[in-house]
Structure formats: C-alpha cells, structure tokens
C-alpha cells in the first residue's frame, strides 16, 4: 500500500524516488524495538569512535536541479507509525560537575521536563506526519522568502554548539507564511543520525529521514527571542528533510566542507555568505504546518512548524560527513541529535495541498480528511 502520488507534481531530475524504493526492513518498527526507533539513544547507547563508520513579494525562484529530490512525502510507502510515547522520551544528562539540571543532552538523565517544565507540555515537537490525516487548507499560500541570497561578505558564524551545527544569519532575511504573518530568519541548524541510522526529527508515517534542516525565524511582532518564546506564532521554523541522492549538493557543500574546522564542541569558524534558500526545497507551495514547540530545552510552545513536502538531496558522502565529523560533550560523537516524536494530543496537521487524496480511486478504506480550520481565512 502506498501513499498517493500527486499528479500535479512536476518530476525533478536526479535522485531516486521513494516510490520505487520501499522502506527497508530496518525501517519497520518491531514490537521490541519501536521505543528505541522513536527514542534517541540513552547514555549507554551514545555512539563512540568504535561505532564508526557505520529550526519579498514573491518566492525566490530557483531552477529545479539535480540537487533536489524527486521524492515527495506523499510518495512514501505506508508504514504503520509507531505509537506516540505517552511521556516525553527525551532525557538530559546531569552535568558531572554538579546538580545543574540545565546541562541537558540527548540521552541519559534527568528527563527534559526537569530541565524545563515546558518539555512536558501537550503540544510539543517533533511529530509524526500522516499525510492522509492532514487537513487540506487552500488558504495556505506559497511561502515568501526575501533576502535569502546572501553576498559572500559579511561572513557568517558557523558553530558546533555541542547539540548541532548552527549557522547564525544576518539581519534582512524575511519570510512570510501568509498575509500579515511575517518573520525574520535568525539561524539554521541540522539534525542527523549516524552511519546506517537516520536522524530527522519529524517523521512521515513512521519513516525517519537521514537528516533535517531547521531555519528558525522570529515574528516581526517581536524584537527579541526572549519576548517571543511561548507566544503563539512568536517563532516559526521551516523544516526540510535531507535524503541521499546521486549528486553532491553544492549549496550544502559550502557548509559541510567546513565542518572539520569546528569538529570540537564550542568551536566556530567564519564562512562566506551563501544562498540560504538553496539549502531548502524549491517548491515553496507544498508543505505541512502545525503548532508545536522548540525541539530542545526549554521546549517553548507556540512555534509554527512548516515542513516541506519536497525533500533535499545530498550525496552519500555528504550525509556521512554531516554525521561523522563533529564531536559533542564528553568526547562523544555528535550524532543522533534528534528528539523523539511527541503526541499530537488532538492537534491537526494542515497541508497546503491535498496530501490525503488518492489520485486513483480505492475500493476500500476511504480516507477521512480532517477539515481545515483556516479554510475561511
């Protein structure tokens, strides 16, 4: 059984389509390992060296290239999604120097809600996206990005902050989710897995992708992040899945080629400005959207998540570089830096396109679509 392919998608050159590429056995959760599949490793599982290798008026238009995936999320085979954990599964690590609970890490103790109570909130991120249950919202218009094509100077700070690799963005990158929903980009960072283990934060029908990019934005209604935290729509994140394709992605290479310089936790380097929009899929019109939270402590809610339907393709070597270069706390590899998917708790994920409508009629199991709350806007 497959999720339907949307006929209006124009095929892109390059990468293999998930349509002809069913999920392998390792992606199918079994009874005994489904909690582990959904849960980042505990302290005892943290990978070490021995395991290797192994957030304008019109959208900027860029030509469809071999660097973008032809796979669309609705093309994925249907896989039974693991049940959402009833309690947040993420843990932080008690700092060895004392009881400071704010020194969170992926894996270990204490639980994140002890680090920040908001992490036990009801509307957390990431989530599992089930396209057939998404509410089609025609009011969700194509995203508008302005000023994302940066000149080489001034250079940008690329930092290994111990949890991810983060690129700090300069003022002037404007993004609109729709009329009156305007934001400024602040930074971008990535989440990834390890050799042979995918590391995206969001999942689709239980399928985890190799990696995920987050571009974090602040609403123009606020001057500073601390004012916006926890306020509905105060922050917005554009998220895209990264997948393996046959070609090197030249946009990502501008960052990945510099990772060795920041291998050590806390280190940073300066990189020339680049086209930030080239790190995202080219199709700004097809996406999923829901209200959630930051995926790391303090896990503040009210964050508008926009997850692109189209994926971005990187070469196998590039994905390996991403997951195998950086070091995190305590002389451990910076890997598997993703949070477990969180329960929707009644939230409805909206889609800007009819993601849950099959292009060919089915004899059985008619799809029940959720209604769009924003349809009248």
């Amino acid at each position: 059984q497959r999720l339907p392919r949307m006929q209006e998608d124009s095929p892109l050159g390059g990468g293999s389509s998930g349509e002809d590429d069913p999920l392998g056995e390792e992606d199918l959760p079994s009874e005994e390992d489904s909690p582990r599949e959904e849960d980042p490793p505990g302290e005892e599982d943290l990978p070490g060296e021995e395991d290797l290798p192994g957030e304008e008026d019109l959208p900027e238009v860029k030509p469809k290239s071999e660097e973008e995936g032809s796979l669309k999320l609705e093309d994925l085979p249907t896989v039974e999604a693991p049940g959402d954990p009833q309690e947040p599964q993420n843990n932080a690590h008690r700092d060895k120097e004392g009881d400071d609970q704010s020194h969170w890490r992926y894996g270990g103790d204490p639980p994140w809600p002890r680090v920040s109570p908001a992490c036990a909130g009801r509307f957390q991120s990431p989530v599992d996206i089930r396209p057939q249950l998404a509410a089609f919202c025609p009011a969700l218009r194509p995203l508008e990005l302005l000023g994302f094509q940066l000149p080489p100077l001034p250079e940008l700070r690329l930092r290994n902050n111990g949890h991810s690799v983060q690129l700090t963005l300069p003022p002037g990158l404007e993004m609109a989710l729709g009329p009156g929903r305007e934001y400024r980009a602040l930074q971008l960072h990535l989440h990834w897995g390890a050799a042979g283990r995918p590391g995206s934060e969001h999942t689709v029908e239980g399928h985890r992708f190799p990696a995920e990019i987050h571009v974090v934005h602040l609403s123009t209604a606020f001057a500073r992040v601390d004012e916006a935290l926890g306020r509905p729509g105060g922050l917005a994140v554009l998220a895209a899945f990264l997948e393996e394709g046959p070609e090197e992605n030249s946009a990502y290479e501008q960052l990945l080629s510099r990772l060795e310089e920041i291998a050590e936790e806390g280190s940073e380097t300066q990189v020339p400005g680049l086209d930030i929009s080239a790190l995202l899929p080219s199709d700004f019109s097809r996406y999923f959207q829901y209200e959630g939270s930051l995926t790391t402590p303090p896990c503040a809610q009210g964050v508008i998540w926009t997850v692109f339907n189209q994926t971005v393709m990187l070469s196998a070597k590039q994905l390996h570089t991403l997951s195998d270069t950086l070091w995190g706390p305590g002389d451990s590899r910076l890997q598997l830096n993703f949070r477990a998917t969180q329960p929707l708790n009644g939230r409805v994920i909206e889609a800007s396109f009819p993601a849950g409508v099959d292009s060919s009629p089915r004899a059985a199991e008619p799809v029940q679509l959720n209604s769009c709350l924003a349809a009248g806007d």
Partner: nanobody, 117 residues
Framework: EVQLLESGGGLVQPGGSLRLSCAAS???????????MSWYRQAPGKGLELVAV???????KYSDSVKGRFTISRDNSKNTLYLQMNSLRAEDTAVYYC????????WGQGTQVTVSS
Amino acid sequence: EVQLLESGGGLVQPGGSLRLSCAASGNSVNIFSFAAMSWYRQAPGKGLELVAVITTTGGTKYSDSVKGRFTISRDNSKNTLYLQMNSLRAEDTAVYYCNADYLQDYWGQGTQVTVSS
C-alpha cells in the same frame, strides 16, 4: 528583555589577574541556561576576536592566544558567566564583551581591560 552586564574590568600590570563577570537579567523565560555563552574582545583598531566559549553542556573552547591562561565558567543558578584571566599580557588590552547565543545573539555593553605597567 534579556540584558547582559559585564563587570570586573580595569587596569592591571603584566602578569596580573582579573576576573570578569557577566550577569544576565530581565528574561521571563530563563534562556541563559540554554545559551552558548562567549567572551569576545576588541582591541583598539582591531576586529572582534572570540576569546572563549562555554556550551550548555559545560564544554569549553579557547582561542590559541589565551589557552592555558584564561578560564571560562558559568553559574546557571546565578545567571552569571565568568572569565578568569591570569598571566595577563599587554596584548590582552581590549574591551571585553559577553555574548549569549540562543537562537539570536545577545550582547553586553563591554568592560575595558587594560594591561600596562
């Protein structure tokens, strides 16, 4: 709104020591604990130079020019960042700025450190 206030700068002789502090205040959601904290400095006529970083996990990183002489630390319970500077040299003379990196950069106003005999 979050404010960072540096203190502890001053005039010191070569070989002497100073301890800089950076106190964070004013934030309703305590982002200090979740920010990578840094000390930068700017010498007269020069650009901004990263001196030291401490991540949320307590990991530290120093510029080569201060390694072994300076120590960065943080006390999240007091929302305070520190920089212990020993064996000070004339070339350490600069305005020292505290930085909190949490989704965006927050900066202090700076504190002057002058190393001179």
